[in-house]
Interface confidence: low
């Protein structure tokens, strides 16, 4: 359906509040360095304009595309050249090139300091004084730090954030109420950001087909009672939604997401028995609930996979006539029968099946050639199962911090050229897989672990792509989306690496270390561990354990000393000398 005014259409569909929030998010994701006040002003102007167009669709400029309107508005920012350098050149281009140019300048690692919450009383005063501005600041701060955040989901989290303050600002002990709730929300937001970044990378680097295959597998596991046509319909719509959000088309994305939620609720009988509760909620909660809905029970009468995909005499004919549809049905049938498998594993199995058919359908006797194809999946299934088992055992033995350190050593040896902050960030996140997944029942462990690892390794790939330094990282990141994790797991020590020169400054510590929160203390120690490895890549685990133990004792000693700074400057060089001697 063609609308006279696209902006009026979206304003009417989304309503003023969601429209303004999405515009604020869009601008904050594009111009990450601009102050909050500038973005509020831009969002207000665009919303006022949309409102005018909704009242009179044939008004001046109301017929312009959203990209043209948004781009023109961004290009009015006076500080564009000073703050963003060559991003200002985007404004010389015409649409759609101008929008592509803005997208290309999104910075996945803008380097803003972590958000530190002021005192609870000050926060509550700000919340009560101007709720809308308070929530706008939240949207802005998250969006500029996470330029690919899934915008409609961010509106949902802002609503949750509002709920937390509405409750806790009435509490007797505001801090005790806010602390754990804000932290829990923060964890969810960070995971949501990483998951969407993975989806955007799938679409941008590997195309629609990769994203659709991922979605077919995931949704078939979740909705095993739905038929393939239903899954395909939802996947097609979901792909459109994520393509729009990843492409910066946030109004269209949010609108289409609401339409998809409406469709799923109207057709829940043919999708899943678990949707009812979600479908009674308002739009933001409804979409979120559907995205997180529990798995439906498997239908009881599923026939053997072999019948359709091995024993049928028409396998090659079916495959050759409509390859993607046939492979899609294979993936759907396999996934709905195996909720315990990770999506990545299911996609590897589909890829293996595809390669087998490609080879066998060209032979004189295809059925004999592919007769054992399902048995050939065993090593592909065993590999992630064994990996999860081994790593969960290690996690249980070492705890989260120790497990992170083991991964730090592992990944620094695999890719010592990668920057230290990236190695620390990624290894810390990889280590959280233990906490997140190892306590789950056996039937959920693999799915939880491998799919979480894929999301974290995507962060490594995204950061590495910005400044590529390791050919092996580039290779693992770009060759195959589903084989990224096995590719990284399979990397051995990089024997070509030339050790980094020793720099005493890197191992100089000060008294301010003592007052840092525990997590930041860990980061400092882990940074030292990585630098140590870059200097002495041949260090054994035993040597590293000794040196890190000494380092922990040194920090503890100096933090307990009367003259902390004096202790650090006196004892530090001794520790470094001892470490160097121990690692010869």
């Amino acid at each position: 359906e063609a609308y006279k005014s696209e902006i009026a259409h979206r304003y009417n569909d989304l309503g003023e509040e969601h429209f303004r929030g999405l515009v604020l998010v869009a601008f904050s994701q594009y111009l990450q360095q601009c102050p909050f006040e500038d973005h509020v002003k831009l969002a207000k102007e665009v919303t006022e304009f949309a409102k005018a167009c909704a009242a009179e669709e044939s008004g001046a400029n109301c017929d312009k595309s959203l990209h043209t309107l948004f781009g023109d508005k961004l290009c009015t920012v006076a500080s564009l050249r000073d703050k963003y350098g060559d991003m200002a050149d985007c404004c010389e281009k015409q649409e759609p090139d101008r929008n592509e140019c803005f997208l290309a300048h999104k910075d996945d690692n803008p380097g803003f300091p972590p958000l530190v919450a002021p005192e609870p009383d000050a926060l509550c005063a700000a919340f009560q004084d101007n709720e809308q501005l308070f929530l706008g600041k939240y949207l802005y701060e998250i969006a500029r730090r996470h330029p690919y955040f899934y915008a409609p989901e961010l509106l949902y989290y802002a609503q949750q954030y509002k709920g937390v303050f509405a409750e806790c600002c009435q509490a007797a002990d505001k801090a005790a109420c806010l602390g754990p709730k804000i932290e829990a929300l923060r964890e969810k937001v960070l995971l949501s950001s990483a998951k969407e970044r993975f989806k955007c990378a799938s679409l941008q680097k590997f195309g629609d087909r990769a994203f659709k295959a991922w979605s077919v597998a995931r949704l078939s596991q979740r909705f095993p009672k739905a038929d393939f046509a239903e899954i395909s319909k939802v996947v097609t719509d979901l792909t459109k939604v994520h393509k729009e959000c990843c492409h910066g088309d946030l109004l269209e994305c949010a609108d289409d997401r609401a339409d998809l939620a409406k469709y799923m609720c109207e057709n829940q009988d043919s999708i899943s028995t678990k949707l009812k509760e979600c479908c009674d909620k308002p739009v933001l909660e409804k979409s979120q609930c559907l995205a997180e809905v529990e798995r439906d029970e498997l239908p009881g009468d599923l026939p053997s996979l072999a019948a359709d995909f091995v024993e049928d005499k028409e396998v090659c004919k079916n495959y050759q006539e409509a390859k993607d549809v046939f492979l899609g049905t294979f993936l759907y049938e396999y996934a709905r029968r195996h909720p315990e498998y990770s999506v990545s594993l299911l996609l590897r199995l589909a890829k293996e099946y595809e390669a087998t058919l490609e080879k066998c359908c060209a032979t004189d006797d295809p059925p004999t050639c592919y007769a054992k194809v399902l048995d050939e999946f065993k090593p592909l299934v065993d590999e992630p199962q064994n990996l999860v088992k081994t790593n969960c055992e290690l996690f249980e033995k070492l705890g989260e911090y120790g497990f992170q350190n083991a991964l730090l050593v592992r990944y620094t040896k695999k890719a010592p050229q990668v920057s230290t902050p990236t190695l620390v960030e990624v290894s810390r996140k990889l280590g959280k897989v233990g906490t997140k997944c190892c306590k789950k029942p056996e039937s959920e462990r693999m799915s939880c672990a491998e799919d979480f690892l894929s999301v974290v390794l995507n962060r490594l790939c995204v950061l590495h792509e910005k400044t590529p330094v390791s050919e092996r990282v580039t290779k693992c990141c770009s060759e195959s989306l589903v084989n990224r994790r096995p590719c990284f797991s399979g990397l051995e020590v990089d024997e070509t690496y030339v050790p980094k020169e020793f720099n005493a400054e890197t191992f100089t510590f000060h008294a301010d270390l003592c007052t840092l929160p525990e997590a930041e203390k860990q980061v400092k120690k882990q940074t030292a561990l990585v630098e140590l490895l870059k200097h002495k890549p041949k260090a054994t685990d035993e040597q590293l354990k000794t040196v890190m133990g000494d380092f922990g004792a040194f920090v503890e000693k100096c933090c307990a000393a009367e003259n902390k700074e004096g202790c650090f400057s006196e004892e530090g060089p001794k520790l470094v000398a001892a470490a160097q001697a121990a690692l010869v």
Epitope: K205, F206, G207, R209, A210, A355, E358, S478, E479, S480
Partner: nanobody, 126 residues
Framework: EVQLLESGGGLVQPGGSLRLSCAAS????????VAWFRQAPGKEREFVAG????????YYADSVKGRFTISRDNSKNTLYLQMNSLRPEDTAVYYC???????????????????WGQGTLVTVSS
């Protein structure tokens, strides 16, 4: 980084044949999805044929199915397009495009290909 260089274009009569070549350097051609696109004067660039990375799955535009064949020689790191039964409407500049990362399929969307050759002109006329 992939460099692509097409050759083999020229003038041919309707019903005739031509074989285009695309020599790749900077990356092995079997590690990348490669495709032929064409652009006729005043028209948009369109997908002609493609071949996946890793597995030789081929795709063709409906207008060339049965007449054109895409293939590659990994030992020569070269992609080919054998064009038979040429028609005047096949007249265009033919481009070779590459999409690294071993995707199993080739996309028909030009934007997804980061690497392009400079093109070779094919004219079908009597």
């Amino acid at each position: 980084e992939v460099q692509l260089l097409e050759s083999g274009g020229g003038l041919v009569q309707p019903g005739g044949s031509l074989r285009l070549s695309c020599a790749a350097s900077g990356r092995y051609i079997d590690e990348t999805a490669v495709a032929w696109f064409r652009q006729a004067p005043g028209k948009e660039r369109e997908f002609v044929a493609g071949i996946g990375g890793g597995v030789d799955i081929t795709y063709y535009a409906d207008s060339v199915k049965g007449r054109f064949t895409i293939s590659r020689d990994n030992s020569k790191n070269t992609l080919y397009l054998q064009m038979n039964s040429l028609r005047p409407e096949d007249t265009a500049v033919y481009y070779c495009a590459a999409r690294p990362g071993k995707p199993l399929i080739t996309s028909k969307v030009a934007d997804l290909y980061p690497y392009w050759g400079q093109g070779t002109l094919v004219t079908v006329s009597s």
